[in-house]
Interface confidence: low
């Protein structure tokens, strides 16, 4: 039988009446155009909805937008368009919501062609009031908030000027011209690239990387011959043109660009690219594109300095620069990532790592599933997950994989069971242990979301026909109840719940269509009465993450430590609540060779945990350029994996001697560094 339909599924008592009392409809007085929705702050219940409608005239497009505000998680909305003087808001800039709980919102308005600059509407009270401000420039990008101070904003203008505001957009100052890309770093630092000659495109590979730590009073050139740059975790990366040819190399800095080291990664040619797939304060996953239009490359994982890299995964699917990759961080369990590889026969297969890229394997076949037509052996196959690439290929996949840090172990995704991803209609699968085991959760494609830190999962069938039914589960997707939320079906466009999965409210968005008009409509359902009591100690059970062999004392050890969690029992129907904090208990493991990556000049042969010297470097002194000094490395081939906390056990010795000799890459020599003041 289909999941959730067997006899042992207990029904939630009187749920229809409870949900009916907590279902709130709001019909928007709008012609259907586009709608965008933003949450303002955390746990505030404030939602802003911007609807825009374009009327195409023969020569130009006339636009109209409306702004609505809710302060009860979407149950009721108020039209606040008059607060922004009924101005048409540019949807391509979206609504710029301030970091944390600052309550700040910036809307960018459409202005007539001849105006001197753009116009913004600013609010610092969770959109209760707005102030109109005319800008001395036309913005090219959305306003970017400093992560450290929400009063500091930066924006690029259509004329490539870098503009900064120190008073939340009230007053603006152009701090630099000829800027291609600008990003906030830590401590209110701004990094940006500039061109000297023609334009950003013409100077690609000859750009300079600059830094200002005082919002434009003074500047320091920290890189030349730059192609592009990126920030990830505590690392600053720059791809830099080589002297002799058109290849580029990655350089990395961990001190905001004061000193640089060349990353031990392959160089790339004109048609290739680098991409930071994921980064934290410990390490980085880097994709390096293969030469030619292959659609794949190699994933490398870094050491703690971002300099020494280990090959993690070959034939990693990643189509062209800025294209699609299925690389997904499973946020519900430490160390877990999922992605796709392009196999020799051009089929796409899903791979998973449980140890931050150390080893990749196929996903285990779900117990309750048959192998499909892609499988050579009907008894042996794997689960393959649909993610960004499938969505870009217009397969019948409405959503990417979903996981939430506070819903420990839960991963939900569309997939197919076979030897490779299938183009057939997918089903929805769930894992409750961070990707080790999977179960078919729902037949056919669905939209899904997690509420109350995993206490409730909500799903809506993906259909071209109007819908009026929502499904929900209180036991991590084992059993499902269906609820008819309206008599009149709507054309469904999306599910919205507050980011962070702590809420118990879900909003169903769609439109109604009659003979003459169509209107936006939302239904907000509050599940608080389904989970009628607060969870108590007895509702939780101890769960050891990454457990594969309970008989082994080191069971669950990943990156040198194991973690036990208190998790809600599947049979408990109760509220984790908005203040729920994941309870976990770490314990340190003994070190083994698995806790070390191979150092510079060493590699791991396949299926071997020992690091051996690279043949071409055998007998040579290992000397390399680090922070602008030549270093001599004495090593037996191992370096602890970033973030690994193991103690005792094996302990390979490693020593780096400073040769006190200056060395530079072609990238940036200390003499070239210069500082300027405005």
């Amino acid at each position: 039988s289909a999941p959730g339909e067997d006899e042992e599924c207990g029904r939630v008592r009187d749920f229809v009446a409870k949900l009916a009392n907590n279902t709130h409809q709001h019909v928007f007085d709008d012609l259907r155009g586009s709608v965008s929705l933003s949450w303002v702050g955390d746990s505030t219940g404030v939602i802003l909805v911007l609807t825009t409608f374009h009327v195409p005239l023969v020569i130009m497009t006339f636009g109209q937008s409306k702004l609505y505000r809710s302060e009860d998680y979407g149950k009721n909305f108020k039209d606040i368009t008059d607060l922004i003087n009924n101005t048409f808001i540019r949807t391509e800039f979206g609504m710029a919501i301030g970091p944390e709980n600052s309550g700040k919102v910036v809307l960018t308005a459409e202005v007539s062609g001849g105006s001197r600059g753009g116009r913004i509407f600013r609010s610092s009270d969770f959109a209760k009031n707005f102030v109109q401000t005319d800008l001395p420039f036309h913005p090219l990008t959305q306003m970017m908030y400093s992560p450290q101070n929400s009063d500091y904003l930066l924006a690029l203008s259509t004329e490539n000027g870098l503009w900064v505001s120190k008073n939340f957009g009230g007053k603006w100052e152009e701090i630099h011209k000829a800027v291609c890309l600008a990003k906030w770093g830590s401590d209110n630092t701004i990094f940006f690239t500039t061109y000297a000659n023609g334009s950003c495109k013409a100077d690609l590979g000859a750009l300079e990387l600059w830094r200002t730590s005082d919002l434009g009073k003074s500047f320091k050139t920290i890189g030349v011959k730059i192609y592009s740059f990126g920030l990830g975790g505590r690392f600053l990366f720059a791809s830099v043109m080589a002297d002799k040819d058109t290849t580029r190399r990655i350089h990395v800095s961990t001190d905001q660009g004061d000193t640089w080291s060349m990353a031990q990664l392959p160089s790339v040619g004109q048609e290739q690219f680098y991409s930071i797939l994921a980064a934290n304060d410990d390490m980085v996953f880097m994709h390096v594109d293969e030469p030619g239009d292959t659609g794949f490359g190699t994933i490398f994982t870094s050491d703690d300095r971002g300099i020494v890299y280990s090959k993690s995964l070959d034939r990693h699917l990643y189509t062209t620069t800025g294209g699609e990759t299925d690389f997904t961080n499973v946020t519900s369990l430490r160390g877990v990532y999922i992605t796709s590889v392009l196999s020799e026969d051009n089929s796409i297969q899903t791979m998973i790592t449980f140890d931050q890229g150390g080893r990749w394997t196929h996903l285990r076949k779900p117990e309750n599933s048959e192998c499909d037509a892609t499988a050579k052996n009907k008894n042996e196959c794997s689960l393959h997950i649909h993610a960004s690439y499938s969505i870009s290929q217009k397969l019948n996949v409405p959503m990417a994989p979903l996981s939430e840090p506070n819903a420990v172990g839960i991963v939900i995704a569309h997939g197919s069971v076979g030897d490779a991803i299938s183009v057939m209609v997918p089903d929805v699968y769930i894992s409750d242990d961070g990707g080790y085991s999977w179960t078919k959760m729902l037949e056919g494609p669905h939209y899904y979301t997690i509420l109350d830190s995993g206490g409730i999962i909500v799903a809506i069938e993906h259909s071209s026909r109007p819908i009026n039914v929502i499904k929900f589960s209180t036991d991590e997707g084992q059993c499902w109840q269906t609820y008819t939320f309206t008599r009149d079906p709507i054309y469904f466009t999306g599910l919205a719940s507050e980011p962070g999965a702590r809420s118990m409210n879900i909003s169903i968005w769609g439109f109604t269509e009659s003979f003459l008009t169509s209107q936006w409509v939302s239904y907000t359902i509050d599940f608080k009465d389904i989970l009628e009591r607060n969870c108590e100690e007895k509702d939780y059970t101890i769960w050891l993450a990454h457990s594969t062999d309970p008989e082994d004392y080191e069971d669950g050890c990943i990156l040198g430590y194991k973690e036990q969690f208190l998790r809600l029992r599947k049979s408990s129907v109760c509220q984790n609540g908005r203040d729920y904090v994941v309870t976990k208990q770490p314990s340190i493991c003994l070190c083994s060779l698995e806790d070390f990556l191979c150092d510079f000049g060493y590699y791991r042969p396949e299926n071997d945990s020992k690091c051996v010297e690279q043949p071409e470097l055998k007998g040579h002194d290992l000397e390399f350029c680090l922070y602008g000094r030549e270093e001599h490395l004495t090593t037996n081939g191992y370096r602890k994996i970033p973030g690994d906390k193991c103690q005792g056990g094996v302990n390979p010795v490693r020593e780096v001697k400073d040769l006190k000799k200056k060395c530079t890459s072609n990238f940036l020599s200390p003499e070239k560094q210069n500082s300027k003041s405005n």
């Epitope: 101890i542 008989e551 082994d552 004392y553 080191e554 194991k562 036990q564 208990q585 770490p586 314990s587 340190i588 003994l590 083994s592 103690q647 005792g648 056990g649 094996v650």
Partner: antibody, heavy 124, light 107 residues
Framework: QVQLVQSGAEVKKPGASVKVSCKAS???????YMWWVRQAPGQGLEWMG?????????SYAQKFQGRVTMTRDTSISTAYMELSRLRSDDTAVYYC?????????????????WGQGTTVTVSS | DIQMTQSPSSLSASVGDRVTITCRAS??????LNWYQQKPGKAPKLLIY???SLQSGVPSRFSGSGSGTDFTLTISSLQPEDFATYYC?????????FGGGTKVEIK
């Protein structure tokens, strides 16, 4: 019942090696750490290191690194501790002890079952 | 290495007395502390694990408390068979280290 039985007393000359055995019974030998602790006459307890029989993974105290080797033979549920280049201050009672397994939350490496001890005397 | 300091190093008490032994770690060890009892010529015996959990088979007059750096072993009513040496042991960070011991003697 769970017990650890150690080999008999040894008298060794300085510079020699000694190998003490510890036979386990009454539980799944492979799944529990086996720790080694020694006690010099009139002194306190000193941790030397341990081995996890399931994978043979070892952990040694820095003080004994290079001189101690811990091994196991899972087929006969026996752990061994060999100490080389013996000195007179290695004279002690050597104990093997089973690492306590946590029931739920990790509870630290306690030692819940001990061998009777093996007296090693190093004297010229 | 983490140093474990026990105090007192010895004490005299009578049957029925309440006895308290303290153990201090040179850095925080969370609650990863165990207490052992050792009688002359015998192997140590685990009394308390994880700072406050009583090992099965150990009389309830033994109790442990503390976390971080300061820990206590309490014998609520000393019995004749309790005269022995008591050791604390941390297992938070490798290497495992023991306290110097507290000898409980008959007054």
């Amino acid at each position: 019942q769970v017990q650890l039985v150690q080999s008999g007393a040894e008298v060794k000359k300085p510079g020699a090696s000694v190998k003490v055995s510890c036979k386990a019974s009454g539980y799944t030998f492979a799944s529990y750490y086996m720790w080694w602790v020694r006690q010099a006459p009139g002194q306190g307890l000193e941790w030397m290191g341990g081995i996890l029989p399931s994978g043979g993974r070892t952990s040694y105290a820095q003080k004994f690194q290079g001189r101690v080797t811990m091994t196991r033979d899972t087929s006969i549920s026996t752990a061994y501790m060999e100490l080389s280049r013996l000195r007179s201050d290695d004279t002690a009672v050597y104990y093997c002890a089973r690492g306590k397994r946590s029931s739920g939350w990790y509870e630290g490496y306690g030692m819940d079952v001990w061998g009777q001890g093996t007296t090693v005397t190093v004297s010229s | 290495d983490i140093q474990m300091t026990q105090s007192p190093s010895s004490l005299s008490a009578s049957v029925g007395d309440r006895v308290t032994i303290t153990c201090r770690a040179s850095q925080s060890i969370s609650s990863y502390l165990n207490w052992y009892q050792q009688k002359p010529g015998k192997a140590p015996k685990l009394l308390i694990y994880a700072a406050s959990s009583l090992q099965s088979g150990v009389p309830s007059r033994f109790s442990g408390s503390g976390s971080g750096t300061d820990f206590t072993l309490t014998i609520s009513s000393l019995q004749p068979e309790d005269f022995a040496t008591y050791y604390c042991q941390q297992s938070d960070v490798s290497p495992i280290t023991f306290g110097g011991g507290t000898k409980v003697e008959i007054k």
